[in-house]
Interface confidence: low
């Protein structure tokens, strides 16, 4: 079989909303996804799994199931939101999202995502991890690949 | 219940300055921010600046980043607004209100100060 | 800045009568948009805040709502202390924004 390519695009959007007496951050982060079957049949994409790190804590995690199938040399963009909360020993970061002196309050999120797809009963999975700017302050919406953060500890692709 | 009681009006010349008060009571005063709007006579509502009781954190509109200095003093409760370089253009009711923790998200202005008259003449 | 342009800026109408009032926003502000009310004597309340959601204590005569970047205040029966001026406030971005006002006058 040929390959099953997936490739990470970036996030698309994030909806804010605060907890002012538990001083808690909550994101819904909607990230993008292009799935490109190389193979001359069609694959099930049968669950996308997905999680955010802020600070190597994990702060959020997604699962889809039963998604789409993908034909022939073809490609399908995939959206999936990841439900994410910023609290109790990372609740100091309440103060940074929520300083209104400040215009733009980004903070660096680890984004991973196992694919999972099957064909002809055979199973495979590909993962990806990317680094990402996200404000916390407000609701944004992003052009794709805007939010990207490249530093060295960046997984090599 | 929420309140936020304002100073009373003031007189004063062209060229001083003035410190108008805003005193909250019944809720969190350091969970909330205070924003501050003009209104001259006959005229409509203008957005000053709000204030982060808890860090002091302000955030101006451009309009009166010269004019106003907002402050807040967490021990009794109480936002200000310092007008400077006064001229009749600031001869208005100033109001005060509340709002949630921040400035982009969240319901906005849900109490108001009864406003404060600022006259300014010679 | 979002420009909030209000109107009518002065209505005359019956007791009893229906009318709505009309901000438009510049730019998107979602639904991050506040109807206040302004008494005579300068009290300012807030009506409605996220587009349509009543204040409590509000009357239910009162309602908000949306069409595109056009936001709307409802008064399904007027009644006399609900002749006053009105304003709608964004706060989708900073700095916030006013919509001129509109007189409310009775008939």
């Known amino acids: 079989p040929r390959s099953i390519d997936v490739k990470y695009i970036g996030v698309k959007s994030a909806y804010v909303s605060y907890d002012v007496q538990k001083r808690t951050i909550y994101l819904n982060i909607t990230n993008t996804l292009n799935i490109t079957n190389n193979n001359y049949y069609s694959v099930e994409v049968e669950n996308i799994t997905a999680q955010v790190q802020f600070a190597k804590t994990v702060i959020g995690k997604a699962r889809l199931n039963n998604i789409t199938h993908i034909g022939p040399l073809d490609m399908k963009q995939i959206d999936y939101t990841v439900p994410t909360v910023i609290a109790e020993e990372m609740s100091y970061m309440y103060d940074f999202c929520t300083l209104i002196s400040i215009k733009v309050h980004n903070i660096v999120l680890m984004m991973q995502v196992t694919v999972t797809t099957t064909y002809f009963g055979h199973s495979e999975q590909i993962s990806q991890e990317r680094y990402q700017y996200v404000d916390c302050g407000r609701n944004t919406t992003y052009q794709l690949g805007q939010s990207e953060y490249l530093n060295v500890l960046q997984p090599q692709q | 219940q929420v309140q936020l009681q304002q100073s009373g009006p003031e007189l004063v010349r062209p060229g001083t300055s003035v410190k108008v008060s805003c005193k909250a009571s019944g809720y969190a005063f350091t969970n909330y921010l205070i924003e501050w709007v003009k209104q001259r006579p006959g005229q409509g509502l203008e957005w000053i600046g709000v204030i982060n009781p808890g860090g002091g954190n302000t955030d101006y509109s451009e309009k009166f980043k010269d004019k106003a200095t907002l402050t807040a003093d967490k021990s009794s409760n109480t936002a200000y607004i310092q007008l400077s370089s006064l001229t009749s253009e600031d001869s208005a009711v100033y109001f005060c209100?509340?709002?949630?923790?921040?400035?982009?998200?969240?319901?906005?202005?849900?109490?108001w100060g009864q406003g404060t008259s600022v006259t300014v003449s010679s | 800045d979002i420009q909030m342009t209000q109107s009518p800026s002065s209505l005359s109408a019956s007791l009893g009568e229906r009318v709505s009032l009309t901000c438009r926003a510049s730019q998107d502000i979602g639904s991050n948009l506040n109807w206040l009310q302004q008494e005579p004597d300068g009290t300012i309340k807030r009506l409605i805040y996220a587009t349509s959601s009543l204040d409590s204590g509000v009357p239910k005569r009162f309602s908000g709502s949306r069409s595109g970047s056009d936001y709307s205040l409802t008064i399904s029966s007027l009644e006399s202390e609900d002749f006053v001026v009105y304003y709608c406030?964004?706060?989708?971005?900073?700095?916030?924004?006013f919509g001129g006002g509109t007189r409310l006058e009775i008939k």
């Open positions: 406030l964004q706060y989708a971005s900073s700095p916030r924004t």
């Open positions: 209100a509340r709002s949630p923790y921040s400035s982009y998200v969240g319901y906005a202005v849900d109490y």
